[in-house]
Interface confidence: low
């Protein structure tokens, strides 16, 4: 019968010929009366056999990531009779892995959006690297993730590549962050190869800022001839938030005379002071009203940022008109 062990050849061997093992018949008494032959894909070009001894050699550098095993056939012939000594047999040569591929991030570029002020531990995004080496061969394709840039705001789980928030962030201070993640094979041991990727993390706005008036005092004038409904001027607050979180509503907080109203122009986010009742210079030549401003949409959990509405004082001077 045939005698052989499992055949393995390491990939990327630089020697011109590398001994893999021996293939022989147990009828072979070593007197060079048998001839061994190798058949199949790779026979003669990639692998050769010593016709007398049955020793098998790899004569080409192999790449496991291109081809991980070769199925060949062996024959043994009695030189004297030209007849087969053993039935033709199939055998396998496995290409064993070396760590010659670095981890690669295939889904680049990574971009994520996370609300500002998110608590520690909030999941941002998962990055995944792949390694072309053999996952079943030692640690060649076992990856560990680490953070090269992004502390102290972000952390990465070493085995999963899950990026989490590790410190609260304020969009109004910085609205985007670049995080650099490294993936290392060989679970970080010597000889490890690595790859990196960048993740752009944008902070979306939450309503953590209340609108505040630009001025503590506004001075407006109104003609005593102005009809009710007249716009007599505008006031304006600013809000460090954006979008709907910066939409605001103006209202009258104090107007003992009940002469004025404030409506909100939602396009410009200005408060428009409107004359509600006609004024008479002779009756009263100036008015003082207090206005307040609040955000339009404030979720319950963010009310703590909006406890006291910003207010402003408006002095309104009535202009005299000569009466006929």
């Amino acid at each position: 019968g045939w005698v052989w062990n499992q055949f393995f050849v390491p990939e990327e061997m630089n020697t011109t010929s590398h001994h893999i093992g021996q293939l022989r018949s147990d009828l072979d008494n070593g007197n060079n009366s048998f001839q061994y032959k190798l058949l199949g894909a790779g026979a003669g070009s990639t692998f050769i056999i010593d016709e007398r001894t049955g020793d098998i050699y790899a004569i080409q550098k192999l790449d496991r990531e291109e081809r991980s095993l070769y199925i060949l056939r062996a024959q043994v012939i009695d030189i004297a009779t030209g007849r087969a000594v053993e039935p033709e047999s199939e055998f396998v040569i496995k290409v064993s892995d070396i760590n010659d591929n670095e981890p690669k991030f295939l889904d680049e570029p990574y971009e994520a959006i996370v609300p500002e002020m998110s608590p520690e531990g909030t999941l941002v995004i998962q990055v995944t690297a792949s390694d072309a080496d053999d996952p079943s061969s030692g640690n060649n394709a076992r990856l560990l993730y680490s953070l090269l840039q992004g502390q102290p705001y972000f952390s990465v789980e070493p085995t999963t590549g899950v990026i989490r928030i590790s410190s609260k962030m304020d969009r109004e201070l910085q609205d985007e962050y670049w995080v650099i993640i490294q993936a290392k094979d060989m679970i970080g041991q010597p000889g490890a190869l690595s790859g990196t990727t960048s993740v752009l993390i944008k902070l979306s706005d939450v309503n953590d800022n209340k609108p505040i008036f630009k001025e503590s005092l506004y001075r407006l004038t109104v003609s005593e001839s102005a009809p009710t409904g007249t716009s007599i001027g505008t006031i304006m607050a600013y809000d460090n938030d954006i979008g709907e979180n910066a939409e605001m509503d103006y209202s009258i907080e104090e107007d003992d005379s009940q002469t004025f109203d404030i409506i909100t122009n939602h396009e410009t986010q200005e408060g428009i002071v409107i004359l509600k009742k006609k004024v008479d210079f002779e009756h009263q030549n100036h008015y003082g009203i207090r206005a307040k401003v609040k955000n339009h949409h404030v979720p319950e959990q963010l009310m703590k940022y909006h406890t006291e509405a910003s207010t402003t004082f408006i002095k309104i001077q009535v202009e005299d008109v000569d009466e006929p």
Partner: antibody, heavy 119, light 107 residues
Framework: QVQLVESGGGVVQPGGSLRLSCAAS????????MHWVRQAPGKGLEWVAV????????YYAESVKGRFTISRDTSKNTLYLQMNSLRAEDTAVYYC????????????WGQGTLVSVSS | EIVLTQSPGTLSLSPGERATLSCRAS???????LAWYQQKPGQAPRLLIY???SRATGIPDRFSGSGSGTDFTLTISSLEPEDFAVYYC????????FGQGTKVEIK
């Protein structure tokens, strides 16, 4: 990568109409407010109009109000500018621009399309 | 509307020199809602600075912005050959308006 490509420009007579298109790719079109900005030959930039991300709010420069209409088709990832009652002073390169997600500046611009209003 | 006035109209400098461009607003620009753009002939504008001082993605650190209220500045610390272009400021505090532009040309 983000790309904005305008088309539809050309020569038109005063009083005529033209519809500009801006094909967007490389980003989630429905998440961004979009603008048209124009630049007369040899002149500076002039903001023309904006449309909100969901298409419900529009806002125009005084110089075009009542004559131009901005619109968008999210299913086609396309922004439009319908220009009616065109005047000689509307002659310009028209750019579409994406409003930055986190503020109101314009982070990406198309290459522009030239509109010439001339008899 | 807020009117922006840029100065100077033209700035003639040599590569390696420092460029300082000014933008003045007719009224206060809230929250430093001011941007700077670069435009080269035949090209679309490119965002350099937003929020008066934040550099846009991919913009070299030789570009910096500063200012608040009504006075804003764009500084190019050391001019590179590719920096010669027209620069526009833009406010987005209330609607959107642009300055008339400053041309930075090779001396």
């Amino acid at each position: 990568q983000v790309q904005l490509v305008e088309s539809g420009g050309g020569v038109v007579q005063p009083g005529g109409s033209l519809r500009l298109s801006c094909a967007a790719s490389g980003f989630t079109f429905s998440s961004y407010d979009m603008h048209w900005v124009r630049q007369a030959p040899g002149k500076g930039l002039e903001w023309v109009a904006v449309i909100s991300y969901e298409g419900t709010n529009e806002y125009y420069a005084e110089s075009v109000k009542g004559r131009f209409t901005i619109s968008r088709d999210t299913s086609k990832n396309t922004l439009y500018l319908q220009m009616n009652s065109l005047r000689a002073e509307d002659t310009a390169v028209y750019y579409c621009a994406r409003e930055r997600y986190f503020d109101w500046s314009f982070d990406y611009w198309g290459q522009g399309t030239l509109v010439s209003v001339s008899s | 509307e807020i009117v922006l006035t840029q100065s100077p109209g033209t700035l003639s400098l040599s590569p390696g020199e420092r460029a300082t461009l000014s933008c003045r607003a007719s009224q206060s620009v809230s929250n430093t809602y001011l941007a700077w753009y670069q435009q080269k002939p035949g090209q679309a504008p490119r965002l350099l600075i937003y929020g008066a001082s934040s550099r846009a993605t991919g913009i070299p650190d030789r570009f910096s912005g500063s200012g608040s209220g009504t006075d804003f500045t764009l500084t190019i610390s050391s001019l590179e050959p590719e920096d010669f272009a027209v620069y526009y400021c833009q406010q987005y505090s209330n609607s959107w308006t642009f300055g008339q532009g400053t041309k930075v040309e090779i001396k």
